[in-house]
């Protein structure tokens, strides 16, 4: 939806980033191995290992 | 990378049935969630169901309760959501998610997304 565009522009081509539509903001996407301690995580800390 | 696609959209009659379909390629996460949103024109997207793929837990949105199902098809890698006793407010673009169950939440990350398949409702 078009008023996704610009948010989703800024993590666009960043591998460790990912845009969630639903909240509508760039999420950190947690390495393989850590799963996330929120919905959207935003920085390494906000993941650990199960 | 995770590729959804999404398929089984349409238009029907208030009352009538559709079922929704998912597929999922790439890899997945083992503790993973795949779910449905909706969004209708000029409206808030809004969660709709999702399943815990692990456990097959499955949750719902109060306004879907009792008429939408989700379920899995592990073989396929495909999630299905079963539309039944349709109402015009259902009429929206359907999107699929897929990400990480929250540790100690029963929330999601939506790390990938489908393209979208629309359900139109008339009365």
């Known amino acids: 939806f078009p008023q996704d565009r610009p948010f989703e522009d800024t993590c666009h081509g960043n591998p460790s980033h990912y845009y969630d539509k639903a909240v509508r903001r760039c999420c950190y996407r947690c390495p393989m191995g850590l799963f996330p301690t929120q919905q959207c995580p935003q920085r390494p800390t906000d993941c650990r290992k199960q | 990378q995770v590729k959804l696609v999404e398929s089984g959209g349409g238009s029907v009659q208030a009352g009538g049935s559709l079922r929704l379909s998912c597929a999922a390629s790439?890899?997945?996460?083992?503790?993973?969630?795949m779910g449905w949103f909706r969004q209708a024109p000029g409206k808030e997207r809004e969660w709709v169901a999702r399943?815990?793929?692990?456990?097959?837990?499955?949750y719902y949105a109060d306004s879907v309760k009792g008429r939408f199902t989700i379920s899995q098809d592990n073989a396929k890698n495909t999630v299905y959501l079963q539309m039944n006793s349709l109402r015009p407010e259902d009429t929206a673009m359907y999107d699929c998610?897929?990400?990480?169950?929250?540790?100690?939440?029963?929330?999601?990350?939506?790390?990938?997304w489908g393209q979208g398949t629309q359900v139109t409702v008339s009365s």
């Open positions: 399943i815990h793929t692990g456990s097959g837990s499955t």
């Open positions: 998610a897929a990400g990480r169950v929250v540790l100690g939440a029963v929330v999601c990350t939506n790390e990938y």
């Open positions: 790439g890899y997945i996460y083992s503790s993973n969630c």
